[in-house]
């Protein structure tokens, strides 16, 4: 129903705390360079204004759209052009073009320092002094670094953060209580960020239809007992929620997500038997829980998929009658039978089925043509299964760090023109798939591996779009989202690449490396590894292993030496010479 004042409506629905959090996230995602204090001031002004509209919906400006209200606030910021350059030009436009313009200026890789966690005592002190401000800082810092983070989910992570601090700051050993717990939240939040970015990419590049197909597959896997009409309703609602969040309409998004959670909990009988524990939780936890609820038990009596989609004489007639509905039912029926497949694979199969019908239904004898379609799925299914087996075997053999290095070598050979920091970030993220997925039961590995890899490769594509340097990467990123991962996997050494000349300074290290945290040490070593591959793209695994072992030994020796600086300055050049010889 239409409301006289949209802002009053959302304030009433969401409540002050969530309203303020979402407005802060929205501003932080649009203007990523502003300080927390600048944004907090705007949030307070917007909240005060919302309250006046709640008191009197007919008050001045209360009838304006949220985009107009928020856009006017952002455009009133002093020194906008000095700080944000051409983003200031957005302010010359009218809605809805102004909001579109803001969206186009979101930066997936803002030049902000890494979000450093203060040490435990300091963190607990500022948390106890002002929990609201502390959590505000968290929302601001995460949102500005991840401009497409799923806003209601970020509120959930802030709530988690809050609970951990409340618990751990009361402990004697705050550090050992906080570190593992906050590391866990950080890891989950980073995965949530790349997954949501993938959804927004799907929406932006291929539209709502593509996202809805993704949602149908995912929901059908999770809720195999729900009928097609129910799955379609859930997919439509979920598409609306994600469209709103990806479009910067965070208040509407969070409100509609809460509505969807409410609907699911009121209709458990027709959706799934596994929802009750989620539905017993408060709002943010409930919605989060529903988003990752375990798959319901598959019905025992499902007929073979071939009956309706291959053997039925009506296939082409049904396809002609309503193409999207027929393909939707195929995707639903196939997905509910295959919780062990990735969504990407299911969408590739649906695409193959569609292409087969397009071709075969135009022939004089369609059944003879499409009769073998299910057999033609086999290579499409085998390819990711082999990928999972090969990579999980390698992960089990090498461990996470060694697995990351193997991926780094592979991807540097595929796209040596890509900047070393991007390659290292990508390889480290891709390498985490081992820890995340390879330890799962067999039937959960494939969906975990492939859908995670697809999300990470989406980030590679986004970063590459900013500064395209590799034809290989451009080729894989230009195709459909579901074909990206197979495309990257199929890439081989880029034969067009002219190797980098050997620069001694690239491989020169100093004693400061010894005091770095383990993660930073790894990144330094991985940076050197990528540079080695750029120098010798066709170096063998043995050659690279020799060099990296030598390098690790050198670091170990010099970091244990009494005079570290002397060790680095004398042994460093020897290491460089040995590296050159080993790779000659």
């Amino acid at each position: 129903e239409a409301h006289k004042s949209e802002i009053a409506h959302r304030y009433n629905d969401l409540g002050e705390q969530h309203f303020k959090g979402l407005v802060l996230i929205a501003f932080s995602q649009y203007l990523q360079k502003c300080s927390y204090d600048e944004h907090a001031k705007l949030v307070q002004e917007v909240t005060d204004f919302a309250k006046t509209c709640v008191a009197d919906e007919s008050a001045a400006n209360c009838d304006k759209s949220l985009h107009t209200l928020f856009g006017d606030k952002l455009c009133a910021i002093p020194n906008l052009r000095e700080n944000y350059g051409e983003l200031a030009d957005c302010c010359t436009k009218q809605e809805p073009e102004r909001n579109e313009c803001f969206l186009q200026h979101k930066d997936d890789n803002p030049s902000l320092p890494p979000f450093e966690r203060p040490e435990a005592e300091a963190m607990c002190t500022s948390f106890k002094e002002n929990p609201t401000t502390f959590m505000g800082h968290y929302l601001h810092e995460v949102a500005r670094r991840h401009p497409y983070f799923y806003a209601p989910e970020l509120l959930y992570y802030a709530e988690q953060y809050n609970e951990i601090l409340t618990q751990c700051c009361a402990e004697a050993d705050k550090e050992s209580c906080l570190t593992p717990k906050l590391d866990g939240v950080k890891e989950k939040a980073l995965v949530s960020s790349v997954r949501q970015r993938m959804k927004c990419s799907s929406m932006q590049k291929f539209g709502e239809r593509a996202f809805k197909a993704w949602a149908v597959a995912r929901l059908s896997q999770t809720f195999p007992n729900a009928d097609f009409a129910e799955i379609t309703k859930l997919a439509t609602d979920l598409t609306k929620v994600n469209k709103e969040c990806c479009h910067g309409d965070l208040l509407e998004c969070a409100d509609d997500r809460a509505e969807l959670a409410k609907y699911m909990c009121e209709n458990q009988a027709t959706i799934s038997s596994k929802l009750q524990t989620c539905c017993d939780k408060p709002l943010l936890k409930k919605a989060h829980c529903l988003s990752e609820v375990e798959h319901d038990t598959m019905p025992a009596d499902l007929p073979a998929i071939a009956a309706d989609f291959v053997e039925d004489q009506e296939v082409c007639k049904n396809y002609a009658e309503a193409k999207d509905v027929f393909l939707g039912t195929f995707l639903y029926e196939y997905s509910r039978r295959h919780p062990d497949y990735s969504v990407s694979l299911l969408l590739r199969l649906a695409k193959k089925y569609e292409a087969t019908l397009e071709k075969c239904c135009a022939e004089a004898n369609p059944p003879a043509c499409y009769g073998t379609v299910l057999a033609e799925f086999q290579p499409l299914v085998e390819e990711p299964k082999n990928l999972v087996k090969t990579n999980c075997d390698l992960y089990e053999k090498l461990g996470e760090y060694g697995f990351q290095n193997a991926i780094l070598v592979r991807y540097t050979q595929k796209a040596p023109q890509v900047s070393t920091p991007t390659l290292v970030e990508a390889a480290r993220n891709l390498g985490r798939v081992g820890t995340k997925c390879c330890t799962l039961p067999e039937d959960q590995r494939l969906p975990c591996v492939e859908d995670y890899l697809s999300a990470i490769l989406n980030r590679v594509c986004l970063l590459h779009e900013k500064t395209p340097v590799s034809e290989h990467v451009t080729k894989c990123c230009s195709g459909s989202l579901v074909e990206r991962r197979p495309c990257f996997s199929a890439l081989t050494v880029d034969e067009t690449y002219v190797p980098k000349e050997f620069k001694a300074e690239t491989f020169t290290f100093h004693s400061d490396i010894c005091t770095l945290p383990e993660k930073e040490k790894q990144i330094k070593k991985q940076t050197a590894l990528a540079e080695l591959v750029k120098h010798k793209p066709k170096a063998t695994a043995e050659q690279l292993k020799t060099v990296m072992d030598d390098f690790a030994q050198f670091l170990d020796t010099c970091c244990k030496a009494a005079d570290k600086d002397t060790c680095f300055s004398t042994e460093g050049p020897n290491l460089v010479t040995r590296c050159k010889d080993a790779l000659a």
């Epitope: 004489q313 082409c316 007639k317 002609a320 239904c361 135009a362 004089a364 004898n365």
Partner: nanobody, 115 residues
Framework: KVQLLESGGGLVQPGGSLRLSCAAS????????MSWVRQAPGKGLEWVSS????????LYADSVKGRFTISRDNSKNTLYLQMNSLRPEDTAVYYC????????SSQGTLVTVSS
């Protein structure tokens, strides 16, 4: 909504000719192969002939081969069946169908071959 409307049937003497038409709407006609099927009184559905979307490929049941010709005009979204040398056993209700379907989703047109 898919609609198929057959016309052109009637009473004809053995050895005579008829041309059946099927006007199609509600789908991308040129993208789909089309067929003619028939149902004689008291019998089941029998496939008669099929044609590809482009019109380049045609198939016929042995019982009509050399006597019937299937064709289409994609600009008019219309399917045809030219029936020559008609026999009493060709008496049936004729239906046009999409892509090899052996079901009646339209009214059909009655062809009676009798002296």
């Amino acid at each position: 909504k898919v609609q198929l409307l057959e016309s052109g049937g009637g009473l004809v003497q053995p050895g005579g000719s008829l041309r059946l038409s099927c006007a199609a709407s509600g789908f991308t006609f040129h993208s789909f192969g089309m067929s003619w099927v028939r149902q004689a009184p008291g019998k089941g559905l029998e496939w008669v002939s099929s044609i590809s979307g482009s019109g380049s490929d045609t198939l016929y049941a042995d019982s009509v081969k050399g006597r019937f010709t299937i064709s289409r005009d994609n600009s008019k979204n219309t399917l045809y069946l030219q029936m020559n040398s008609l026999r009493p056993e060709d008496t049936a209700v004729y239906y046009c169908t999409i892509g090899g379907s052996l079901s009646r989703s339209s009214q059909g047109t009655l062809v009676t071959v009798s002296s």
